[in-house]
């Protein structure tokens, strides 16, 4: 069964910059990425950064670098002051769309021991949608 | 969750009618884009035709002048009203919302689909 896994980092530098990985471990053909936080997309969560494999990539603030890492995995900066800054319990989705065969989203978000900088090794979260 | 039902496909012989619809739910409604991919048998997806957040229509060459699609905010509803129809429209025809890249609507969500047949 597809999984998809999400880790999320705060870096040791900027207190206020997270890094966000999210990566599909299944077989199928991603057609669409979706990375919110919030909640997960279209249910309360609020659009970071959608990454097509051909058409390219868009992003809203604060996002600042959202990039492909390889076919199956992407990765997502974000840095905010104020209001659009997130805070260190904010929750992080993925999601991932193989259209027309299904869609597999996963959330995270800081772990709360977890120092600036430093995280696991990402693991498979578990799935909370496919279609 | 996010939720399409497709409804209206059918057996309709060429050159009628047929209008689908889309029931949507789960989601803010004034999204990026909205729209119709069909799938023929043995074939590879087809953006068909969608409507933008501005309420402009675009639709793929080959069913220019023929099919129509409409939104109704009020009923969160998306429409198809396909005219003219012919042998080469038939396919699953799958209600989309997605985000416009260029003017490609990527789909994010879909439906179930609904078979369209053109068949006398």
């Known amino acids: 069964t597809p999984e998809v896994w999400v880790q999320v980092r705060m870096e040791a530098t900027e207190l206020s910059s997270f890094t966000i990985r999210c990566g599909f471990l299944g077989s199928g053909s991603i057609s669409l990425v979706t990375v919110s936080w919030g909640g997960p997309n279209g249910a309360g969560g609020t659009t970071l950064a959608v990454l097509h494999p051909e058409r390219g990539i868009r992003q809203w603030a604060p996002a600042r670098q959202a990039r492909w890492e390889t076919q199956s995995s992407i990765s997502l900066i974000l840095e905010g002051s104020g209001a659009s800054s997130p805070c260190a319990n904010t929750t992080f989705c993925c999601k991932f769309a193989s259209f027309p065969e299904g869609s597999w989203e996963a959330c995270g978000s800081l772990p709360p021991s977890s120092d600036p900088g430093l995280s696991a090794p990402p693991t498979p979260a578990p799935i909370l949608r496919a279609d | 969750e996010v939720q399409l039902v497709e409804s209206g496909g059918g057996l309709v012989q060429p050159g009628g009618s047929l209008r689908l619809s889309c029931a949507a739910s789960?989601?803010?409604?004034?999204?990026?884009?909205m729209g119709w991919f069909r799938q023929a048998p043995g074939k590879g997806l087809e953006g068909v035709a969608h409507?933008?957040?501005?309420?402009?229509?675009r639709y793929v060459e080959s069913v220019k002048g023929r099919f129509t699609i409409s939104r109704d905010n009020a009923k969160n509803s998306l429409y198809l009203q396909m005219n003219s129809l012919r042998a080469e429209d038939t396919a699953v025809y799958y209600c989309?919302?997605?985000?416009?890249?260029?003017?490609?609507?990527?789909?994010?969500?879909w439906g179930q689909g609904t078979m369209v047949t053109v068949s006398s």
């Open positions: 789960g989601f803010t409604f004034s999204t990026d884009c």
């Open positions: 989309v919302v997605g985000f416009k890249f260029g003017d490609y609507c990527a789909p994010n969500d």
């Open positions: 409507i933008d957040s501005d309420g402009i229509p």
